[in-house]
């Protein structure tokens, strides 16, 4: 899964459905797989925020051991801390579980910065605020790690929700969601509503706050407004999609659309930022700078290295442009666009300036591994991972942060030709996709 500004995410926890709530619109939608409507038991089952990740409570073993697990759509292993670590409040103790089975196999996962390694086994797993089922799932018991767990993050493991192709050590290790669908009647679909707080949260606020919802097996209509628009999953490894056009404040970046997907575009809840390929990043920043030229900010800000601070409540949102990504639609020559606000791509950072200041980090960054639609994108939307129909749906999130002038948007259809040409075909080599 992409590291660097990639998982583990950095900075604090929490994030509640705050800011202005949009009115509910009633739109009819095509029939969805699985249950629809209300999933009261699963709503608000996530805590966290974009900087350090969103986590769900899970239980592992018999008797059940409760752990907080980071929800990561950019990887495919279920891995939990299984040995003492200075940043862990608790960890999985295999010796205390009567249902643990050792697979007698190790696993090693390196990142650009850091790594984790552990021992593979299986055990009984359930999600208290999820479907009322228990499954036997593969678990990587992390025995050693470096720069993986985050001090104060409050999560002890990671739930990789992507496909088997990118599982470690290889694709024969069945991911948790595959096991869940195989062993139960849970439909092959999940949806995520990640709620950015819009302002920094201290540790106590985080632990008391709601960070969003992971609806397993369906779609909850209370979590979004307007219509769901779907884009095909190009290939089942990461949740790969195709971006066909990018606009900054309505101005087309006018790049060959292949550049937007070089070498792939993925939806990844385990990445903090919107990460863009080098050429696209440079063009986007140039355009954002031009749009916000009534002020000038240091280069370090655009590199995500420096924070810009304004007196509390005076952040000039209006000088920053909206960013629209056009995604391939389900119908030939049809696309739709998702639009995010500066409230999504300027990430509030706690604890740095005075209490009378609001400080932000620019949460768009450069990537050498393609576009990564991370938490800053996902915080604007309710995102449906419809694995059964090999598609991803986007609708405006009921908890996204906005102001009285602009809101995030999902709009379409738009006529776009030759969208298939926007996909990049990665040369088939046995390279490690995780070493990024």
């Amino acid at each position: 899964t992409q590291h660097g500004i990639r998982l583990p995410l950095r900075s604090g926890l929490g994030g509640a459905p705050l800011g202005l709530r949009l009115p509910r619109e009633t739109d009819e939608e095509p029939e969805e797989p699985g249950r629809r409507g209300s999933f009261v038991e699963m709503v608000d089952n996530l805590r966290g925020k974009s900087g350090q990740g969103y986590y769900v409570e899970m239980t592992v073993g018999s008797p059940p051991q409760t752990l907080n697990i980071l929800v990561d759509t950019g990887s495919s292993n279920f891995a939990v801390g299984a040995a003492p670590h200075p940043f862990l409040h608790r960890y999985y103790q295999r010796q205390l579980s009567s249902t643990y089975r050792d697979l007698r196999k190790g696993v090693y996962v390196p990142y650009t910065q850091g790594k984790w390694e552990g021992e593979l086994g299986t055990d009984l797993v359930s999600i208290p605020h999820g479907p009322n089922v228990t499954v036997r799932a593969n678990i990587a018991a992390i025995t050693e790690s470096d720069k993986f767990f985050i001090n104060g993050s409050n999560w002890e493991g990671i739930l990789g929700l992507a496909y088997a192709e990118i599982a470690r050590p290889d694709d024969s290790l069945e991911p948790f969601f595959d096991s869940l669908v195989k062993q139960t009647h849970v439909p092959n679909l999940f949806s995520l509503q990640l709620c950015g707080a819009g302002f920094p949260l201290n540790q106590s606020e985080v632990l008391a706050s709601v960070g969003g919802s992971m609806i397993i097996g369906g779609i909850d209509h209370s979590l979004y407004t307007g219509s769901l628009w779907y884009t095909p999953i190009r290939r089942e490894w990461y949740y790969e999609v195709i971006i066909v056009r990018v606009e900054i404040n309505g101005q087309d970046l006018k790049m060959d659309c292949k550049e937007y997907n070089y070498d792939k575009s993925i939806v990844d809840s385990g990445t903090t930022n919107l990460r863009l390929p080098k050429k696209v990043f440079e063009a986007a920043v140039k355009s954002i700078k031009a749009a916000s030229s009534t002020e000038k900010f240091p280069d370090g800000f655009w590199l995500g290295e420096q924070l810009v601070c304004w007196q509390a409540g005076t952040t000039p949102w209006n000088i920053f442009p909206v960013i629209s990504l056009y995604l391939m639609g389900e119908v030939t020559n049809q696309s739709f666009r998702i639009t995010i606000l500066p409230q999504q791509y300027l990430r509030p950072v706690e604890d740095v300036a005075t209490s009378q200041d609001d400080c932000y980090k620019f949460a768009i960054s450069q990537s050498s591994t393609g576009t990564v639609m991370g938490a800053v994108i996902m915080e604007g939307f309710y995102v449906v991972f419809d694995r059964a129909r090999k598609r991803i749906g986007f609708a405006v999130s009921a908890c996204h942060v906005h102001d009285e002038f602009r809101t995030a948007a999902v709009e379409g259809p738009f006529v776009t030709l030759d969208m298939e040409d926007c996909g990049y075909n990665i040369p088939q080599t046995d390279e490690s996709t995780l070493m990024t």
């Epitope: 009534t294 240091p298 400080c359």
Partner: antibody, heavy 120, light 108 residues
Framework: QLQLQESGPGLVKPSETLSLTCTVS??????????WSWIRQPPGKGLEWIGS???????YYNPSLKSRVTISVDTSKNQFSLKLSSVTAADTAVYYC????????????WGRGTLVTVSS | EIVLTQSPATLSLSPGERATLSCRAS??????LAWYQQKPGQAPRLLIY???KRATGIPARFSGSGSGTDFTLTISSLEPEDFAVYYC??????????FGGGTKVEIK
């Protein structure tokens, strides 16, 4: 060679408004991508940032002084100004104007400073 | 709020000696830190920026090091004109505003 020069009264009565002007010579405020700042230093003490302004008129102020400070720019005169209202003896200081350069991060050019005493 | 603490408050040295001044930030400021020199009756002068880069016209005897929370200004061999007050300033949080309390380098 760009130079900065502060000007204004050296004595201000308590509760009145302190007004200073910084004249930029050797270059144009309107065409340069710098922020222009005011910094003060009470006698025998350290440096305190008051605020900064961009050519567009966008300002940033020290939160502790915000309610009393106004910084403005006059590009036609190549000047920027400081007004500090309701002054007390605690506002007695040497007031410097400075340019924020080096990637708009650091105060790379300073005026000589002007001592303003608040006294009745 | 990021607080910059300079130490020692006063450093008594003789010309030709090496001076080592410390600036500690209450949390990481990456490498966004500068050092200024101020002589009596004069405005401060930028010496070092981005923790280790010398400003234009600054002699090579001045060097800066450090990143994160701990920074050092070193004057390899003190000249008579180096006796002054030195301030550090962080700009991890922008706009630039936070200065340390200063270190006075005086003749022993």
């Amino acid at each position: 060679q760009l130079q900065l020069q502060e000007s204004g009264p050296g004595l201000v009565k308590p509760s009145e408004t302190l007004s200073l002007t910084c004249t930029v010579s050797g270059g144009s405020i309107s065409w340069s991508s710098y922020y222009w700042s005011w910094i003060r230093q009470p006698p025998g003490k350290g440096l305190e940032w008051i605020g900064s302004i961009y050519r567009s008129g966008r300002t940033y102020y020290n939160p502790s002084l915000k309610s009393r400070v106004t910084i403005s720019v006059d590009t036609s005169k190549n000047q920027f100004s400081l007004k500090l209202s309701s002054v007390t003896a605690a506002d007695t200081a040497v007031y410097y104007c400075a340019r924020v350069g080096h990637g708009i991060n650091y105060f790379d050019l300073w005026g000589r400073g002007t001592l303003v005493t608040v006294s009745s | 709020e990021i607080v910059l603490t300079q130490s020692p408050a006063t450093l008594s040295l003789s010309p030709g000696e090496r001076a080592t001044l410390s600036c500690r930030a209450s949390r990481s400021v990456n490498s966004y830190l500068a050092w200024y020199q101020q002589k009596p009756g004069q405005a401060p002068r930028l010496l070092i920026y981005d923790a280790s880069k010398r400003a234009t016209g600054i002699p090579a005897r001045f060097s800066g090091s450090g990143s994160g929370t701990d920074f050092t200004l070193t004057i390899s061999s003190l000249e008579p004109e180096d006796f002054a007050v030195y301030y550090c300033q962080q700009v991890y949080t922008w706009p630039p505003r936070t200065f340390g309390g200063g270190t006075k380098v005086e003749i022993k």
